[in-house]
Amino acid sequence: QERRFQLEGPESLTVQEGLCVLVPCRLPTTLPASYYGYGYWFLEGADVPVATNDPDEEVQEETRGRFHLLWDPRRKNCSLSIRDARRRDNAAYFFRLKSKWMKYGYTSSKLSVRVMALTHRPNISIPGTLESGHPSNLTCSVPWVCEQGTPPIFSWMSAAPTSLGPRTTQSSVLTITPRPQDHSTNLTCQVTFPGAGVTMERTIQLNVSYA
């Protein structure tokens, strides 16, 4: 015996591969104080949840660690957080509040998640002019990456002498000391999203001035 409620907002959400999306969900205001249950997000047609706060329930291997139920009954929050989105996450999902002690549960309407190809590319920023024999810091950044996702792997490729500087979840610094012969050569920053198995890169030509 189920009681239905409507998810607020759009009927579908779009996310790019490797990135994050929040599927909004609010518990029904008709939920009585006496209903203490666990929350479960399901892929349409599946019996095993993709995310839950039930300590005794297994979740699908495919979504473990990437899908999280953001459970806060005080604020009526039952949203689903998806990180490291993969193509096979492309599906319809619904939320269910259930207690084995109670006859009825609460089931939400369905919401479709559409996973698109990653179109964002890394940015490479160069502070001013590159001077031969002088070290400069180049930054490769992916500001569109969400903090809670698996940190991307940055790789730099250049013929010029380089050393790696500090990195964050969203950026990597490369210290380059160019030589005259490095003028017009390529420098590439490659960013791999291990959670989704997607790689993006940006290549620039070095413009080296002589001291």
Partner: antibody, heavy 114, light 107 residues
């Protein structure tokens, strides 16, 4: 009006049995899990047992496991607690409550003494 | 089993005082914590459910807060009818344990 009324308490000798009842009214009893909670004289509240809406799931406190049995008859809107092998430490006021514990009965007193 | 501890075990206060009672769980119970008031010879009464939601009909001077393992019940301005024993209880999982109680009496 939502109401729970316990009955069946009394004085019983150690080792004997007693069955408590809890009559429910004013709500759809068959949709709710139910609890038994007890309170020894001058002591705090102790959760005893819970039963699901259809009786298929039951769980007991370690202190009563194997001796007490929780059951229900949805056709009679009644919750039961069968207490066997009673001990002096089972002396308490026994309350029934709905699953959310927002509705309680007034309690029935069980005294285990020789 | 999840153990709940309450502090203080008893306190003396005056009408109008702000009273704070804490409840600590032996493991994280998210926000599955409830608070009850019990007066001598009476059944317990639900005050707060899901750590901070005020039960219907309960005066707004009662409030709850906390999540995980540490929770607080606050009475903003103690009234004569508030002198009672207060219990926390977790509904995270079986067994559904209660705290030992905090008795609030008149100073």
């Amino acid at each position: 009006e939502v109401q729970l009324v316990e009955s069946g308490g009394g004085l019983v000798q150690p080792g004997r049995s007693l069955r408590l009842s809890c009559a429910a009214s004013g709500f759809t009893f068959s949709s709710y899990g139910m609890h038994w909670v007890r309170q020894a004289p001058g002591k705090g509240l102790e959760w005893v047992a819970v039963i699901s809406y259809d009786g298929s799931n039951k769980y007991y406190a370690d202190s009563v496991k194997g001796r007490f049995t929780i059951s229900r008859d949805n056709s009679k809107n009644t919750l039961y607690l069968q207490m066997n092998s009673l001990r002096a430490e089972d002396t308490a006021v026994y309350y029934c409550a709905n699953y959310g514990m927002d509705v309680w009965g007034k309690g029935t007193t069980v005294t285990v003494s020789s | 089993a999840i153990r709940l501890t309450q502090s203080p075990s008893s306190l003396s206060a005056s009408v109008g005082d702000r009273v704070t009672i804490t409840c600590r769980a032996s493991q994280s119970i998210s926000s599955y914590l409830n608070w009850y008031q019990q007066k001598p010879g009476k059944a317990p009464k639900l005050l707060i459910y899901a750590a901070s939601s005020l039960q219907s009909g309960v005066p707004s001077r009662f409030s709850g807060s906390g999540s995980g393992t540490d929770f607080t019940l606050t009475i903003s301005s103690l009234q004569p009818e508030d002198f009672a024993t207060y219990y926390c209880q977790q509904s995270y999982g079986t067994p559904f344990t209660f705290g030992p109680g905090t008795k609030v009496d008149i100073k």
